[in-house]
């Protein structure tokens, strides 16, 4: 499934993300523009054998299971395949562990370069929440 | 078929501003990312900065922090790129250049014509 | 600031020639690794994206692998239309930075 913006906050909201961890809603869904474009089945496969999975590119070495990545470590205990859901529920809980893990949210490159520091909250103007 | 075209070719004194434009066609405007790189005669790429037109807020290199302004028009599908007190080593060739997929590689797909910006007294 | 440094800075060859470039960082990138090539007079033109996707339309003679901080551009056989420098890009953190290019000139 490929979200429209304000439908996205709204799911992420309602999934307990505004103010996770001190991030903004905002900050989910401009993560979430430039990891995967909204696409809940976005997939890349990394140089390394692993793959990013879903609308949040959840790392198949660290974070979910595959099949295919060796030495994965599996640490949100779901298989790869649940981050493609169009049921945002298992990205969500999923990425909770991750921004608790120590680095917050620059564990995502694309959040580092694309939104940490903007004005964040513009991805969630004009949308009711 | 993406098009970007930019303005013409300009020459300016030392210390001066010039603004440069790039007008997309062709594809969605609004929601990608369009970034400016430069390249000095016989020299690399070097990228100074990126806006996102839907939002307008832009985001630049730190080396040209505080000497460049990009903007972006939406509803003239135009990307602009200002920068001030030129010196001789501004003079270049400025692209314009859009995101590409997937996002989080940030490439870049398409790219303007360039536009020869020369510094001279 | 990561620096990204290619090997060769030029080199000569034939066509039909196999031509391998090489592009480091100064930091490990993961597979945020782009290449572009660039012919007299135009813009850059994307090749490879996450350091080893072909972008569509660009011929299966171009290829990338590489991981962390070292990263390959081949030509499986180099073509009369090859003949352009080819610049890395990476886009790990900002601000994003390139090579300083190589240039594929005719032996």
């Known amino acids: 499934k490929v979200f429209g913006r304000c439908e996205l906050a709204a799911a992420m909201k309602r999934h307990g993300l505004d103010n996770y961890r001190g991030y903004s809603l905002g900050n989910w869904v401009c993560a979430a523009k430039f990891e995967s474009n909204f696409n809940t089945q976005a997939t890349n496969r990394n140089t390394d054998g692993s793959t990013d999975y879903g609308i949040l590119q959840i790392n198949s070495r660290w974070w979910c299971n595959d099949g295919r990545t060796p030495g994965s470590r599996n640490l949100c205990n779901i298989p790869c395949s649940a981050l493609l859901s169009s049921d945002i529920t298992a990205s969500v809980n999923c990425a909770k562990k991750i921004v608790s893990d120590g680095n917050g949210m620059n564990a995502w490159v694309a959040w580092r370069n694309r939104c940490k520091g903007t004005d964040v909250q513009a991805w969630i103007r004009g949308c009711r929440l | 078929q993406v098009q970007l075209v930019q303005s013409g070719a300009e020459v300016k004194k030392p210390g001066s501003s010039v603004k440069v434009s790039c007008k997309a066609s062709g594809g969605t405007f609004s929601s990608y990312g369009i970034s400016w790189v430069r390249q000095a005669p016989g020299q690399g790429l070097e990228w100074m900065g990126w806006i996102i037109p839907i939002f307008g807020t832009a985001n630049y290199a730190q080396k040209f922090q505080g000497r460049v302004t990009i903007t972006a028009d939406e509803s003239t599908s135009t990307a602009y790129m200002e920068l001030s007190s030129l010196r001789s080593e501004d003079t270049a060739v400025y692209y314009c250049?859009?995101?590409?997929?997937?996002?989080?590689?940030?490439?870049?797909?398409?790219w303007g014509q360039g536009t020869l910006v020369t510094v001279s007294s | 600031d990561i620096q990204m440094t290619q090997s060769p800075s030029s080199l000569s060859a034939s066509v039909g020639d196999r031509v391998t470039i090489t592009c480091r960082a100064s930091?490990?990138?993961?597979?945020?690794l782009n290449w572009y090539q660039q012919k007299p007079g135009k813009a850059p033109k994307l090749l490879i994206y996450?350091?080893?996707s072909l972008q569509s339309g660009v011929p299966s003679r171009f290829s990338g692998s590489g991981s962390g901080t070292d990263f390959t551009l081949t030509i499986s056989s180099l073509q009369p239309e090859d003949f352009a420098t080819y610049y890395c890009q990476q886009s790990y953190s900002t601000p994003l930075t390139f090579g300083q290019g190589t240039k594929v000139e005719i032996k």
């Open positions: 250049a859009r995101d590409g997929n997937p996002f989080r590689y940030w490439p870049f797909d398409y």
């Open positions: 930091q490990s990138i993961s597979s945020y």
């Open positions: 996450a350091a080893s």
